[in-house]
Amino acid sequence: KSSNEATNITPKHNMKAFLDELKAENIKKFLYNFTQIPHLAGTEQNFQLAKQIQSQWKEFGLDSVELAHYDVLLSYPNKTHPNYISIINEDGNEIFNTSLFEPPPPGYENVSDIVPPFSAFSPQGMPEGDLVYVNYARTEDFFKLERDMKINCSGKIVIARYGKVFRGNKVKNAQLAGAKGVILYSDPADYFAPGVKSYPDGWNLPGGGVQRGNILNLNGAGDPLTPGYPANEYAYRRGIAEAVGLPSIPVHPIGYYDAQKLLEKMGGSAPPDSSWRGSLKVPYNVGPGFTGNFSTQKVKMHIHSTNEVTRIYNVIGTLRGAVEPDRYVILGGHRDSWVFGGIDPQSGAAVVHEIVRSFGTLKKEGWRPRRTILFASWDAEEFGLLGSTEWAEENSRLLQERGVAYINADSSIEGNYTLRVDCTPLMYSLVHNLTKELKSPDEGFEGKSLYESWTKKSPSPEFSGMPRISKLGSGNDFEVFFQRLGIASGRARYTKNWETNKFSGYPLYHSVYETYELVEKFYDPMFKYHLTVAQVRGGMVFELANSIVLPFDCRDYAVVLRKYADKIYSISMKHPQEMKTYSVSFDSLFSAVKNFTEIASKFSERLQDFDKSNPIVLRMMNDQLMFLERAFIDPLGLPDRPFYRHVIYAPSSHNKYAGESFPGIYDALFDIESKVDPSKAWGEVKRQIYVAAFTVQAAAETLSEVA
């Protein structure tokens, strides 16, 4: 049940009043306003939008709205020396060149400053060589090539299709395989839904459309030149050779028309199986090199982008809490886009804007939340989550002591089928309870709750009658708050019915065709899905900021810890002989999980019974809830990933977008059969079990009675 207990409250100033104030028409207007020109990070246009948002948030009634600027490493194409890829003949003549830009969508032909497709942070270079097709360039794809097909990528240019995993992982894998360049392309199998027309006649990717994106492997570092510390006026910056996460080989993205021209000539080996074939009319041969008459032709990349230290601007708005002003609930989403940002990020930014307006309206009527709410419009998310990370680095001491929760607000939609939620287990019950109170926007579910339509369309694989809630991974601005600082976090958006294509994004992702019209014509003409997402995000913020007792249920953490322990144990048990030889035991972990379960259960009982009118006891219980997520943080971080410090969750080492549970143990076990020193490898498994067991036990003890 929603709460309305803040000071100066009148009965109407409760969750319902907040939700009723949210209007689809406003979200639509804001989206239009935010998408008329590009807002690339580090540009004047994006600075102007920051100032506009600052001004409007002030008008909406926030207590203060400040710009927080940082000077971070960004990457841009050379305006006079464009990037492209060519096929060259034996004389070195270019007989085919890829396109230099995407054909602009109707109505946008005269817009200036559309950045051409590029892979941000690619080094400069003009490598030439034979092509190898590497499927999605996942770890398992390179295993297939190297170990099974005996294809050596060393000194080759590889071509990989976008999808399945974060593009930075693809580039890292290619580098490790010895490639000297990477071409990324969008295959229609992943970015062209059957039965739907290409933009502007539908929401599919045209052949000339290209996905932009950064190719960093930052592992949570933020600005590559100032890892761990804010990129402020007196920052000490690393030299470019010591920068974190930069790729070492040239990378460039292309569309499927251009990819066809490269792939149709491929020779060498046939693809190993159907999972390597896309939807183009090409054989999907792996190579290396071209076939028959074309075998003397090579591929050459021409990459001239530059890395530049550039100023970025976050907008930080504050709505001071009436009772616990030193407890922060944060709603944040980014503002910078690759081009127009019709979905990413402005469908999210428009929702945040309307949430701020609604909170501001209540505040103007005399209401305040119990706890402080911080609103953030992050910059340079597309360049590696830089704005959010730098701000969190600058404010880490405050955040680790005062941070209650972080709710992320990037794209509100990636489809219009059902809700998608990723969050800490602490928020499961909050999300369930909230969605039971909200109306479903879905056709066929009129008069039914959002919970009901969500559960029907996206059922939990473990618990019948409940919806799927996924683990937090990364690739968005919650990363620093959750993975580094241990602040309970969550995200929600409307998604597609496309489980098999979970990490490929929607077809027009990061292309010039991600416009206002894309959303208004094809995804959400009534803006009803945007409104629902605003209600979910805003409702979560409202409850987190306003409920007397924090709406966290530690028992749900106990349940998932057992599930994750079972899962990692079963992975390890694929090596029964080695476990015996090296005396590998999971007893300590299972014991810690059992203790956590019992202590969490007792804590929940006390939570029902304690005297809520005693502010000291209330604060004490709430602090135990707030600091539970923090208790899963290991100050030493994960091996080789010091900014991923959460012991229960981390972004997968093979796909930044995906979350992995017990990541330390998982990575120690991964491919262990190929390790040259098995004794050392299994020793690391044992060490990681020890770290995990200790952390779970230590977290459990934070929930014990304090004395």
Epitope: E140, K144, G267, G268, S269, P272, D273, N285, T291, E673
Partner: antibody, heavy 115, light 107 residues
Framework: EVQLVQSGAEVKKPGASVKVSCKTS????????IHWVRQAPGQSLEWMGN????????TYNQKFQGRVTITVDKSTSTAYMELSSLRSEDTAVYYC????????WGQGTLVTVSS | DIVMTQSPDSLAVSLGERATLSCRAS??????VDWYQQKPDQSPKLLIY???TRHTGVPDRFTGSGSGTDFTLTISSLQAEDVAVYFC?????????FGAGTKVEIK
């Protein structure tokens, strides 16, 4: 040491189906392609199809027009080949082979189709 | 389908002498050709992949060469244990296809 152990000989009537198993050991099952090949008495080798045990991706020889189905059971590191609508000309030794280059072979399973 | 034509059908060579086996593809297959050895009543064994790379444990008297459409397997000094049927195979395009085999005997 890599080993592929196939199920025993089968005698089937025309029109029936046969399912041959191939239990693997000594390597990481999901890493190597599994192919199925047959060899009629005194004849050459004929490729039937393959599977990626990691994700179940398959490719079949069109000649077998949907008569062949290749599957895997990751939990037991076993591959299966089922051939339906058997005819006398399907009498052959059926081999599984692990590795894209057919690096390791099973001992073969003789399938006799006779009325 | 790509047809792999092997010649000769059979070959008799004296112990210690060179044996040269040929394989021709009906269209360009690059270097995506493998060679297999099948001894009587045994399963085939991989000898050569990528036209010229010896598989682990294969004696260095076995050499593969060629690209495009013409491929050769050479046994530089025939040993008694080399008596077998040798198959070439292309894996440049589906369906993967084998040659009819060359039978190597001792003269």
């Amino acid at each position: 040491e890599v080993q592929l152990v196939q199920s025993g000989a089968e005698v089937k009537k025309p029109g029936a189906s046969v399912k041959v198993s191939c239990k693997t050991s000594g390597y990481t099952f999901t890493e190597y392609t599994i192919h199925w090949v047959r060899q009629a008495p005194g004849q050459s080798l004929e490729w039937m199809g393959n599977i990626n045990p990691n994700n179940g991706g398959t490719t079949y020889n069109q000649k077998f027009q949907g008569r062949v189905t290749i599957t895997v059971d990751k939990s037991t590191s076993t591959a299966y080949m089922e051939l339906s609508s058997l005819r006398s000309e399907d009498t052959a030794v059926y081999y599984c082979a692990a590795g894209w280059n057919f690096d390791y072979w099973g001992q073969g399973t003789l399938v006799t189709v006779s009325s | 389908d790509i047809v792999m034509t092997q010649s000769p059908d059979s070959l008799a060579v004296s112990l210690g002498e060179r044996a040269t086996l040929s394989c021709r593809a009906s269209q360009d297959v690059g270097t995506a050709v493998d060679w297999y050895q099948q001894k009587p009543d045994q399963s085939p064994k991989l000898l050569i992949y990528w036209a010229s790379t010896r598989h682990t444990g294969v004696p260095d008297r076995f050499t593969g060469s060629g690209s495009g459409t013409d491929f050769t397997l050479t046994i530089s000094s025939l040993q008694a244990e080399d008596v077998a049927v040798y198959f070439c195979q292309q894996r440049n395009s589906y369906p993967l296809t084998f040659g009819a085999g060359t039978k190597v005997e001792i003269k």
